[in-house]
């Protein structure tokens, strides 16, 4: 047993058939020796008497907030929630696995720059009761700070049948170094907390491998005189880091047909322009990426030709 | 693999025009990004236009932009680079260039597969 924050503790329990649990020692936080009662939730039945209170824990029913009394005042609350190792694996039944860069995804992270300043995300199909919280640092054994913020619900999704819920959280980090060669990664790690089990999640990554920048900016077409031609330019995104001379992007540009049977072209470029042939109809997109490491792609920036 | 072979040089006085062409063997000719380079004498080998595989995408150097149309036909295996308004500077040879996924503006090493170069004089 071990204590998750104040009065909140997490039993860790071998989950199978008739295991034996976890015996758990409870103790009343006051002065007072004696006429102490100890119930569960919301039930009255006294549990047991006196300032410690002894449990077996083998299942959710005997997890929930243990509260001691005297002549009917409440003295203090120790809530205990359940974490399952199945088969030696801890279990992970409240978030979704992502299967994105590969099985097992639970957290996602992208950073849009080298400012130290990333997003985590992961999936849901519980609404209710569900709790999250987030630290992270770099390096474990001896950690360098990051401060996330609150895991907030950013989008609801129908699939299929059920609902999916996206939470995200930002973390930046402390004392972050753009151009530093980094040797340690970041740790994010996510406790989740739904009714009475308690689930943790891990992620473990450099900036450089997270990085995904915002799609190019001021995607424009200019018609070149006398010509079918048009000539293309775009800049950099906003959120991208500067100096854009060391922070350098590649380009890919890509010009599709109006069917999608149509062959796409597409070529890839340090310029921030192009020349076109503008067929009608066509559309013409460009995506971003770090020039000298090859994390993601931005998303595209599209135009239409017309 | 495809290989290249450059006709259409010649001299010519400023202000003139030139077609140079660049003719290419094998099948995957359609497969490639086609580049027009050039390397005057004494100076390092620079990028002049390059185009798209299917020809609808290209660029230009600042310095020939308005002046140096790329084109290419696939059917015929060629690529072109109509030349106009020549200047005594644009006296060079000139190289026709063949690379399945370069990164335009990076230059030469982007490119695996080379032409013999045709030479090209402007005059004044």
């Known amino acids: 047993i071990w204590e998750l924050k104040k009065d909140v503790y997490v039993v860790e329990l071998d989950w199978y058939p008739d295991a034996p649990g976890e015996m758990v020692v409870l103790t009343c936080d006051t002065p007072e020796e004696d006429g102490i009662t100890w119930t569960l939730d919301q039930s009255s039945e006294v549990l047991g008497s006196g300032k410690t209170l002894t449990i077996q824990v083998k299942e959710f029913g005997d997890a929930g907030q243990y509260t001691c009394h005297k002549g009917g005042e409440v003295l203090s609350h120790s809530l205990l929630l359940l974490h399952k190792k199945e088969d030696g694996i801890w279990s992970t039944d409240i978030l979704k696995d992502q299967k994105e860069p590969k099985n097992k995804t639970f957290l996602r992270c992208e950073a849009k720059n080298y400012s130290g300043r990333f997003t985590c995300w992961w999936l849901t199909t519980i609404s209710t009761d569900l709790t999250f919280s987030v630290k992270s640092s770099r390096g474990s054994s001896d950690p360098q700070g990051v401060t996330c913020g609150a895991a907030t619900l950013s989008a609801e999704r129908v699939r299929g049948d059920n609902k999916e819920y996206e939470y995200s959280v930002e973390c930046q980090e402390d004392s972050a170094c753009p151009a530093a060669e980094e040797s340690l990664p970041i740790e994010v790690m996510v406790d989740a907390v739904h009714k009475l089990k308690y689930e943790n999640y891990t992620s473990s990554f450099f900036i450089r491998d997270i990085i995904k920048p915002d799609p190019p900016k001021n995607l424009q077409l200019k018609p070149l005189k006398n010509s079918r031609q048009v000539e293309v330019s775009w800049e950099y995104p906003d959120t991208w880091s500067t100096p854009h001379s060391y922070f350098s992007l590649t380009f890919c540009v890509q010009v599709q047909g109006k069917s999608k049977r149509e062959k796409k072209d597409r070529v890839f470029t340090d310029k921030t322009s192009a020349t076109v042939i503008c067929r009608k109809n066509a559309s013409i997109s460009v995506r971003a990426q770090d020039r000298y490491y090859s994390s993601s792609w931005s998303e595209w920036a599209s135009v239409p030709c017309s | 693999e495809v290989q290249l072979v450059e006709s259409g040089g010649g001299l010519v006085q400023a202000g003139g025009s030139l077609r140079p062409s660049c003719a290419a063997s094998?099948?995957?000719?359609?497969?490639?990004?086609m580049g027009w380079f050039r390397q005057a004498p004494g100076k390092e080998r620079e990028s002049v236009a390059t185009i798209s595989r299917s020809g609808v995408i290209t660029d230009y150097a600042d310095s020939v932009k308005g002046r140096f149309t790329i084109s290419r036909d696939n059917a015929k295996n060629t690529v072109y680079l109509q030349m106009d308004s020549l200047k005594p500077e644009d006296t060079a040879v000139y190289y026709c260039?063949?690379?399945?996924?370069?990164?335009w503006g990076r230059g030469p090493d982007e490119y695996d597969t080379w032409g013999q170069g045709t030479q090209v004089t402007v005059s004044s």
């Open positions: 260039a063949a690379a399945r996924s370069p990164v």
């Open positions: 094998g099948r995957t000719f359609s497969n490639y990004n």
